[in-house]
Amino acid sequence: SGTTNTVAAYNLTWKSTNFKTILEWEPKPINQVYTVQISTKSGDWKSKCFYTADTECDLTDEIVKDVKQTYLARVFSYPAGHVESTGSTEEPPYENSPEFTPYLETNLGQPTIQSFEQVGTKVNVTVQDEWTLVRRNDTFLSLRDVFGKDLIYTLYYWKSSSSGKKTAKTNTNEFLIDVDKGENYCFSVQAVIPSRRTANRKSTDSPVECMGHEKGESRE
């Protein structure tokens, strides 16, 4: 038969950060190849990554069409060297992925502090708005465009001479905080989607940036 000795894929896993979305699976192929299909709950199956010997498939182009939809993927196993024939009626072994809703499940990428500027006893800290592959009217959208006010940033800031971290929060990409004159401060930010009730509600922390280094500016 056309699928002799092919093994169904298993451990199908979605890996997604800032909507860049890859489906991974096992096993590493021995004498077999894979094709992936993806669909929304109500849509038609679309094939991707045809007859690949990889164990991953980038499905970003499909899921960014509507990040609030729920997607399902499946991975078909074929013998190595398989060529599609119109006469083949036997369905190859396949495995379904878990359902995946990008808006709810994509991980938040590590944010970056774009700049900070001190004016007297105030510091304005700006978080870089990351671009995604989500499009609207042929324009790529930023993370803020996609999530709107659902996305907040927590700023941790502390005097270089102390260990206690103060916090501030914003649902824009800017913070304006009070600082003590003549003190140097360090900053780190974290992206958060408070409405999520799952482990992926927070990003990892940004790299720490400290006053007196190149990203900052000071004005009296």
Partner: antibody
Framework: EVQLVESGGGLVQPGGSLRLSCAAS????????IHWVRQAPGKGLEWVGY????????YHADSVKGRFTISADTSKNTAYLQMNSLRAEDTAVYYC?????????????WGQGTLVTVSS | DIQMTQSPSSLSASVGDRVTITCRAS??????VAWYQQKPGKAPKLLIY???FLYSGVPSRFSGSRSGTDFTLTISSLQPEDFATYYC?????????FGQGTKVEIK
């Protein structure tokens, strides 16, 4: 169901130490911030400090700085308040509370509290 | 640190009364104010967040409002289960600070 359960309170002599635990269930503490708040008998609420278990960042109120230390063990889903050099004025019910980390950051869930009495 | 000055410290009211409690922040806290209810021997419970948003499961007779640095908790028609102590809290900056509390007693 989200739950916070404090334990470890009791009677301790001035200068002594105590470690309080705050065991969380129904959510993962690394996704939130955990605060400790205390209430002396017949008095109001006083914030003690916080920890972000995802990075270990903490801040302690001036009244306890240098004496109290907040920590967390994400594998146990538990936060801790280590209290050293205890004074009579530390006598209070100690609560842990979850901060949902939204812009307004209300404390949306609280534990039932554990009583710490500092007396000789 | 930001001070939250709450008034009155106590009040007596009857079932059905409209009750108003106020908190004044010593500096701008935007809308980062929450209100809690506490009954004797129990932990505080969240009522209002972001100055005016009713927390899930809280009866609609509770409401919150903001005018500059003044924040108000209103109970439109006091019920027997509402006799308790109420606290405001700012979480605009670290450290978060609480008001002194308002004890609502039966007249």
């Amino acid at each position: 169901e989200v739950q916070l359960v404090e334990s470890g309170g009791g009677l301790v002599q001035p200068g002594g130490s105590l470690r309080l635990s705050c065991a969380a269930s129904g959510f993962t503490i690394s996704g939130y911030i955990i605060h400790w708040v205390r209430q002396a008998p017949g008095k109001g609420l006083e914030w003690v400090g916080y920890i972000d278990p995802s990075n270990g960042y903490t801040y302690h109120a001036d009244s306890v700085k240098g004496r109290f230390t907040i920590s967390a063990d994400t594998s146990k889903n538990t936060a801790y308040l280590q209290m050293n050099s205890l004074r009579a004025e530390d006598t209070a019910v100690y609560y842990c509370a979850r901060d949902d980390q939204s812009v307004s950051s209300p404390f949306d869930y609280w534990g039932q509290g554990t009583l710490v009495t500092v007396s000789s | 640190d930001i001070q939250m000055t709450q008034s009155p410290s106590s009040l007596s009211a009857s079932v059905g009364d409209r009750v108003t409690i106020t908190c004044r922040a010593s500096q701008d806290v935007n809308t980062a104010v929450a209100w809690y209810q506490q009954k004797p021997g129990k932990a505080p419970k969240l009522l209002i967040y972001s100055a005016s948003f009713l927390y899930s499961g809280v009866p609609s007779r509770f409401s919150g409002s903001r005018s500059g640095t003044d924040f108000t908790l209103t109970i439109s028609s006091l019920q027997p289960e509402d006799f308790a102590t109420y606290y405001c809290q700012q979480h605009y900056t670290t450290p978060p600070t609480f008001g002194q509390g308002t004890k609502v007693e039966i007249k």
